[in-house]
């Protein structure tokens, strides 16, 4: 759920690492009301997560470190 | 109640690999994060890296980025890490763990089954 | 990457003490952290997670306090039991990272 940019709320679904190309991080101090990571498909989808989740941050790491490797 | 049952003891050539399984027993598999820790005689815990079954992919400590490799099978709830280049540092006891809540909860909550550890010891 | 100071990393102490022991993380963790027991040739057990939940089955005079950086465990009265190695664990962030290990001995 967003508006605008911002995530309002989180998904309730688990997403596969492997339909995920990138992320953006939301910070509840920068004009958002939450903390949100932003998960970016290949199906050029938008996806709000809780960045607490296992999952989420499981995500994040795989993806930055693609990104350091490129 | 959830059990971590962990391959035997390792004696390897300086320059070989070793592959360690981990398998589980009575509870979920696939959802929960394993990681695992290592431990040098007299020395303390090092986290290597997990693995989420489901996922598939592993997440490394940097300082093993390039000679481990974590995998799973979700048909048999065996995970396995496998160190490569082995050299006399890398003689340690290696434990599996699970974290104590599955994938889809908070992170934070810590690692509540172990596996007994399998000893490795690399000697030429 | 987080890396997590423990101290001391020694301390003898008497059955009965209480006792402390700290953990710093080199950057603000909220409570992702956890507690760890080890006994010599045994795998690590859970004492306490989130900063001060404690386990399911640890005795109650094991405490967990702290948020941020700064991190405490507390015996609040050690039995002969107790006597090992501590260990915290930050799981804040990939990768998880330990502290070196405190050894509780007998004085």
């Known amino acids: 759920a967003s508006n605008f940019d911002c995530c309002l709320g989180y998904t309730d679904r688990i997403l596969h690492p492997k339909f995920i190309v990138g992320f953006t991080r939301q910070l509840a101090n920068e004009g958002c009301d939450i903390n949100a990571i932003i998960f970016h498909t290949k199906k050029k989808l938008s996806v709000c997560a809780n960045p607490k989740q296992t999952w989420v941050k499981y995500i994040v790491r795989l993806l930055s470190k693609k990104v350091k490797n490129m | 109640e959830v059990q971590l049952v962990q391959s035997g003891a390792e004696v390897k050539k300086p320059g070989s690999s070793v592959k360690v399984s981990c398998k589980a027993s009575?509870?979920?598999?696939?959802?929960?994060?394993i990681s695992w820790v290592r431990q040098a005689p007299g020395q303390g815990l090092e986290w290597m890296g997990g693995?989420?079954?489901?996922?598939?992919?592993?997440n490394y400590a940097p300082k093993f980025q390039d000679r481990v490799t974590l995998t799973a099978d979700e048909s048999t709830s065996t995970a396995y890490m496998e160190l490569s280049s082995l050299t006399s540092e890398d003689t340690a006891v290696y434990f599996c763990?699970?974290?104590?809540?599955?994938?889809?909860?908070?992170?934070?909550?810590?690692?509540?089954?172990w596996g007994r550890g399998t000893m490795v010891t690399v000697s030429s | 990457d987080i890396q997590m100071t423990q101290s001391p990393s020694f301390l003898s102490a008497s059955v009965g003490d209480r006792v402390t022991i700290t953990c710093r993380a080199s950057?603000?963790?909220?409570?992702?952290l956890a507690w760890y027991q080890q006994k010599p040739g045994r795998a690590p057990k859970l004492l306490i997670y989130?900063?001060?939940s404690l386990q399911s089955g640890v005795p109650s005079r094991f405490s967990g306090s702290g948020s941020g950086t700064d991190f405490t465990l507390t015996i609040s009265s050690l039995q002969p039991e107790d006597f090992a190695t501590y260990y915290c664990?930050?799981?804040?962030?990939?990768?998880?990272?330990f502290g070196g290990g405190t050894k509780l001995e007998i004085k």
């Open positions: 763990a699970r974290d104590s809540t599955d994938f889809s909860g908070d992170s934070g909550l810590g690692m509540d089954v």
């Open positions: 009575g509870g979920t598999f696939s959802s929960y994060a």
């Open positions: 693995i989420i079954p489901m996922f598939g992919a592993g």
């Open positions: 950057q603000g963790i909220n409570n992702y």
């Open positions: 989130a900063a001060s």
């Open positions: 664990l930050q799981d804040s962030d990939y990768p998880l990272t």
